[in-house]
């Protein structure tokens, strides 16, 4: 049994880091493998992650972490029984994939303005809370070409757009994702999408 693709990990910079790797053949990850991880710090204890299958030879493990900060560094040991298959390290702050924003809501009761709001996925005491920027994706269910991205570079988790910038009388969907420049993160996953019917009063023409 050998590791074909070494583990690569990403952290949500809050409580979970996800590591993925590939073995050189079909593997029952949960019964055959264990990923041990330990913070390089006074008093830290070794923790064991039981991996799940991710395709025939692929494995994925969700590492639980407390109080993740930039100084943290973890040692990783991948074991198959008594055999050490791979040894490495992981610094969560250097491999951040933010959590997806939640509670995306479209408020259509503001005069001819669409107000989209969502929730910041981090608590106020987390460093990322004040450092997320967002991308809002709006698309038409009727017209695949009607697909647009709005970059929200301010901190407030909201976006206002004129309803007239979208076509009237048809349904739209929206979703939002986040990233943080300070840690050069990847983009988060998209939030679940929300749907609304876009209608507005056409301006009266003489």
């Amino acid at each position: 049994m050998k590791v074909l693709q070494e583990p690569t990990c990403v952290s949500d910079y809050m409580s979970i880091s996800t590591c993925e790797w590939k073995m050189n053949g079909p593997t029952n990850c949960s019964t055959e493998l264990r990923l041990l991880y330990q913070l390089v710090f006074l008093l830290s204890e070794a923790h064991t992650c039981i991996p799940e299958n991710n395709g025939g030879a692929g494995c994925v493990c969700h590492l639980l972490m407390d109080d993740v900060v930039s100084a943290d560094n973890y040692t990783l040991d991948l074991w198959a029984g008594q055999q050490l298959l791979w040894k490495g390290s992981f610094k969560p702050s250097e491999h951040v994939k933010p959590r997806a924003p939640g509670n995306l809501t479209v408020h259509t009761n503001v005069s001819d303005t669409l107000l989209l709001t969502w929730s910041n996925p981090y608590p106020p005491d987390n460093y990322l809370y004040n450092h997320l920027t967002y991308a809002v994706n709006i698309w038409s269910e009727n017209d695949p070409a009607d697909f647009r991205i709005y970059n929200v570079t301010y901190l407030e988790p909201s976006l206002r757009i004129a309803a007239s910038t979208l076509k009237s009388g048809i349904s739209y969907r929206a979703r939002v994702r986040a990233w943080a420049q300070c840690y050069n993160t990847t983009w988060s996953e998209w939030s679940p999408s929300t749907k609304w019917h876009n209608s507005y009063r056409e301006p009266f023409e003489q």
Epitope: F41, L42, L43, E45, D66, D67, A71, D72, D125
Partner: antibody, heavy 116, light 111 residues
């Protein structure tokens, strides 16, 4: 919000022991390390040791080895610092502080006076 | 005796900028992260800067931190009378066993 509430001031005789408590609230108690530091009158800060509330493991500054004991009670979210064989130089304000590499939140401090 | 050296005192007038240095070595500041604490008279220390240059929420951007090699600096701009306090740097010693270190402390006087 996070609160670290420490026990009240103590006056002790040389050779005695003192036990200071620090009750935590407003966060997951077992998810954050707790440090103890002290500050003698008019002096700087001095680190004493650390406890992991999750398992109860401890590490102490070499200067206090053998004289200090840190414990925790997860049922009351409280950590304790006991210092024995007190001498006059131990007169100081003792602080608990939550954190790992740095100290996010501090208790208000407990003044321990050692005097004959 | 702390191995992190700070000037015993600094002073400046309201509205001015002041810097406080913290000098260490390769086994502490040079190989670890720096934090800064403010201790107002008669109160407990308070975290001002962590991870060399990050501010906890609620700390105004008048306070900033930097690190270069084996020394670190705290800068305070737009000085206010309420900033008069003792300031301590902190880091970790990584030579043999890891343990936290505090600087000698600096008394800031706002003239």
């Amino acid at each position: 919000q996070v609160q670290l509430v420490q026990s009240g001031a103590e006056v002790k005789k040389p050779g005695a022991s003192v036990k200071v408590s620090c009750k935590a609230s407003g966060y997951a108690f077992t998810s954050y390390y707790m440090h103890w530091a002290r500050q003698a009158p008019g002096q700087g800060l001095e680190w004493m040791g650390i406890i992991n509330p999750s398992g109860g493991s401890t590490s102490y500054a070499q200067k206090f080895q053998g004289r200090v004991t840190m414990t925790r009670d997860t049922s009351t979210s409280t950590v304790y610092m006991e210092l024995s064989s007190l001498r006059s130089e131990d007169t100081a304000v003792y602080y608990c502080a939550r954190g790992k590499w740095w100290f996010y939140d501090w208790g208000k401090g407990t003044l321990v006076t050692v005097s004959s | 005796q702390s191995v992190l050296t700070q000037p015993p005192s600094v002073s400046a007038a309201p509205g001015q900028k002041v810097t406080i240095s913290c000098s260490g070595g390769s086994s502490n500041i040079g190989n670890s992260y720096v934090s800064w604490y403010q201790q107002l008279p008669g109160t407990a220390p308070k975290l001002l800067i962590y991870d060399n240059n990050k501010r906890p929420s609620g700390i105004p951007d008048r306070f900033s931190g930097s690190k270069s090699g084996t020394s670190a600096t705290l800068a305070i701009t737009g000085l206010q009378t309420g900033d008069e306090a003792d300031y301590y740097c902190g880091t970790w010693d990584t030579s043999t066993t890891m343990y936290p270190l505090f600087g000698t402390g600096t008394k800031l006087t706002v003239l």
